[in-house]
């Protein structure tokens, strides 16, 4: 297993619709053809997997049908979008990249993107 640098923004504020997008960029030492991207969430020292996708270079990322993540790839960059976020989902979202094929296997873990999520203010009741 060889180490690889992964860069991602430090802080992102999700949209009022609970959508956050950020780029995860990895310094590929070779010509990988198969890449696996995993998003981990760290909150209160607990780490959980949010979503993961394996893709062939040049193809779209395919997450599971019920995943809250979508993404596109371009060269050594992966543009990740996480949707359906609520204020309780605020936390550090860490991008993990694995170059699966061809060997050697490379692993890179970013420092994480702190995603802040603000629940929209409830609309005031209106009488008609």
């Amino acid at each position: 297993c060889k180490a690889m640098h992964v860069a991602q923004p430090a802080v992102v504020l999700a949209s009022s619709r609970g959508i956050a997008s950020f780029v995860c960029e990895y310094a590929s030492p070779g010509k990988a053809t198969e890449v696996r991207v995993t998003v981990l969430r760290q909150a209160d020292s607990q780490v959980t997997e949010v979503c993961a996708a394996t893709y062939m270079m040049g193809n779209e990322l395919t997450f599971l049908d019920d995943s809250i993540c979508t993404g596109t790839s371009s060269g050594n960059q992966v543009n990740l979008t996480i949707q359906g976020l609520r204020a309780m989902d605020t936390g550090l979202y860490i991008c993990k990249v694995e170059l699966m094929y061809p060997p050697p296997y490379y692993l890179g873990i970013g420092n994480g993107t702190q995603i802040y999520v603000i629940d929209p203010e409830p609309c005031p009741d209106s009488d008609f």
């Epitope: 992102v12 204020a87 702190q114």
Partner: antibody, heavy 117, light 108 residues
Framework: QVQLVQSGAEVKKPGASVKVSCKAS????????ISWVRQAPGQGLEWMGW????????NYAQKLQGRVTMTTDTSTNTAYMELRSLRSDDTAVYYC??????????WGQGTLVTVSS | EIVLTQSPGTLSLSPGERATLSCRAS???????LAWYQQKPGQAPRLLIY???SRATGIPDRFSGSGSGTDFTLTISRLEPEDFAVYYC?????????FGQGTKVEIK
């Protein structure tokens, strides 16, 4: 080193608007946010809101909603805070600060905005 | 809105003494999202502690933070002349982000 430099002091009349700038250097501007905090004379710190320089999304303190606008210019690594319909109780030192994962650091030197007729 | 109440309002101590500053939240705050700042007259605030207990870069080890839930503490083990200032706690746990009203540490 990481630095935030703010624009100079302003004197405004009630009802006018003010726009304070905050120029960042020494780090990747779009990787962080910029928050604005104000301090009335002899008082404590009041959080006004913040902007994510990565995507331009904003979160404002409810009491200022509708009067404040925070923006960034990523080509010049500068953040702006505009406050409209100024009142005498808006007289304060206005600070910008870089927003990290769970901290404000560093802070700008502050901009005194005086609202007086 | 989470209200942060700092106590005491003023702490009168001599150099070399230990200072204990309290910050109490009206609702539970994740310790990841609690910070402390120091402000001297005519200056901008300076980050001391983030994540309730992590010292910011360049902050001397006489400053320490602790606590969880609704009760947080900033401790200055031995006051130096340059430590006499106002100290603020701040929470990032829920919007709006809020500051405590401050504790002034003055020379006795």
């Amino acid at each position: 080193q990481v630095q935030l430099v703010q624009s100079g002091a302003e004197v405004k009349k009630p009802g006018a608007s003010v726009k304070v700038s905050c120029k960042a250097s020494g780090y990747t501007f779009t990787s962080y946010g910029i928050s604005w905090v104000r301090q009335a004379p002899g008082q404590g710190l009041e959080w006004m809101g913040w902007i994510s320089a990565y995507n331009g999304n904003t979160n404002y303190a409810q009491k200022l909603q509708g009067r404040v606008t925070m923006t960034t210019d990523t080509s010049t690594n500068t953040a702006y805070m505009e406050l409209r319909s100024l009142r005498s109780d808006d007289t304060a030192v206005y600070y910008c600060a870089r927003v990290g994962a769970n901290w404000f650091d560093p802070w700008g030197q502050g901009t005194l905005v005086t609202v007086s007729s | 809105e989470i209200v942060l109440t700092q106590s005491p309002g003023t702490l009168s101590l001599s150099p070399g003494e230990r200072a204990t500053l309290s910050c109490r939240a009206s609702q539970s705050v994740s310790s990841s999202y609690l910070a402390w700042y120091q402000q001297k007259p005519g200056q901008a605030p300076r980050l001391l502690i983030y994540g309730a207990s992590s010292r910011a870069t360049g902050i001397p080890d006489r400053f320490s933070g602790s606590g969880s839930g609704t009760d947080f503490t900033l401790t200055i083990s031995r006051l130096e002349p340059e430590d006499f200032a106002v100290y603020y706690c701040q929470q990032f746990g829920s919007s709006p982000w809020t500051f405590g009203q401050g504790t002034k540490v003055e020379i006795k």
